[in-house]
């Protein structure tokens, strides 16, 4: 986990002081989940929960580059759409998945076509 | 599963080069670190340095600065070690290995140089 | 650069015993550690990686651990075709390093 500071930013949790300075969010047990985030405003210090999403530090870091396909059809039932990921490069040490599947709401526009796709179909 | 086929190791007079090859099939060639280590005789491993098909990133052990190049050429799978001015100590069996760190490396057989007058 | 020692040297035991081969680097390099086995006249094969982590094909009595500056490879009963070289290698920093090697032979 990177140790630079996150840029200023403005009133901290509860506090009167008008800038902190935020610290990266820091795992409490291996490198993803739920862990803490260190604040400092003058002398004083602060430390507020936060999470690191699993499958975004491992996969979607810059540990790990993907090539991805185009996105597919939208899906009428889960009004979603998918694209699958072949991976282009690790960092030495990254253990990134081969391939990932990322999926995306559809816009309302692709989810309307679909669902009248779905409603021609069954006529 | 990836396979790497080595080539082009033999004899060569002091001073001379030599360029060797490491063919990759099976798995994605482009997607994984290629390593080059060498070891001489009754001694043990020794790294020369790695190369990125995908972008030809290349991170070298300082020692072969000036005596190790290394390439890819995508369109045919296959990753270069070039050395130059070679000496009786570069004898060596010099190795390819497709590292990923997400299911382990594949090595080549190894092609022996031997520099020699 | 990493130095790494391993120890010992050449160990001598027979086929059903327990091997204990030690790796120090001079430096922390967290789980970034590698154990190899080498056999005369082949090319290295990974045993263990990331201190601990088993690889795929490699029998279960082979296992590691770490991390830090001190790991261990463990041959929980040796059987004959184990005997060979061993090797340590990190990949924590430039440039990769390997250990001196321990020779693993028949008592």
């Known amino acids: 986990v990177a140790k630079k500071k996150d840029k200023v930013k403005k009133g901290g949790p509860g506090s009167e002081c008008a800038e902190w300075a935020w610290g990266p969010c820091t795992p409490s047990s291996k490198d993803c989940g739920v862990g803490f985030r260190e604040g400092t405003c003058g002398a004083q210090t602060q430390r507020i929960r936060c999470r690191v999403p699993c499958n975004w530090k491992k996969e979607f870091g810059a540990d790990c580059k993907y090539k991805f396909e185009n996105w597919g059809a939208c899906d009428g039932g889960t009004g979603t759409k998918v694209r699958q990921g072949t991976l282009k490069k690790a960092r030495y040490n990254a253990q990134c998945q081969e391939t990932i599947r990322v999926t995306k709401p559809c816009t309302p526009k692709t989810k309307a076509k679909a669902k009248a796709k779905k409603g021609k179909g069954k006529d | 599963q990836v396979q790497l086929v080595q080539s082009g190791g033999g004899l060569v007079q002091p001073g001379g080069s030599l360029r060797l090859s490491c063919a990759a099939s099976g798995q994605s060639f482009s997607s994984y670190w290629m390593n080059w280590v060498r070891q001489a005789p009754g001694q043990g491993l020794e790294w020369i340095g790695m190369?990125?098909?995908?972008?030809?990133?290349?991170i070298l052990n300082q020692k072969f600065k000036d005596k190790a190049t290394l390439t890819v050429d995508i369109s045919k799978n296959t990753a270069y070690l070039q050395m130059n001015s070679l000496r009786a100590e570069d004898t060596a069996v010099y190795y390819c290995?497709?590292?990923?760190?997400?299911?382990?490396?594949?090595w080549g057989q190894g092609t022996l140089v031997t520099v020699s007058s | 650069d990493i130095v790494l020692t391993q120890s010992p040297a050449t160990l001598s035991l027979s086929p059903g015993e327990r091997a204990t081969l030690s790796c120090r680097a001079s430096?922390?390099?967290?789980?970034?550690l590698h154990w190899y086995q080498q056999k005369p006249g082949q090319a290295p094969r990974l045993l263990i990686y990331?201190?601990?982590q088993s690889i795929s094909g490699i029998p279960a009595r082979f296992s590691g651990s770490g991390p830090g500056t001190d790991f261990t490879l463990t041959i929980s009963s040796l059987e004959p075709e184990d005997f060979a070289v061993y090797y340590c290698q990190q990949s924590n920093s430039w440039p990769l390093t390997f250990g001196g090697g321990t020779k693993l032979e028949i008592k």
């Open positions: 990331y201190a601990s």
């Open positions: 290995s497709s590292w990923s760190a997400k299911r382990g490396d594949f």
């Open positions: 430096e922390s390099i967290s789980n970034n």
């Open positions: 190369i990125h098909p995908s972008d030809s990133e290349t």
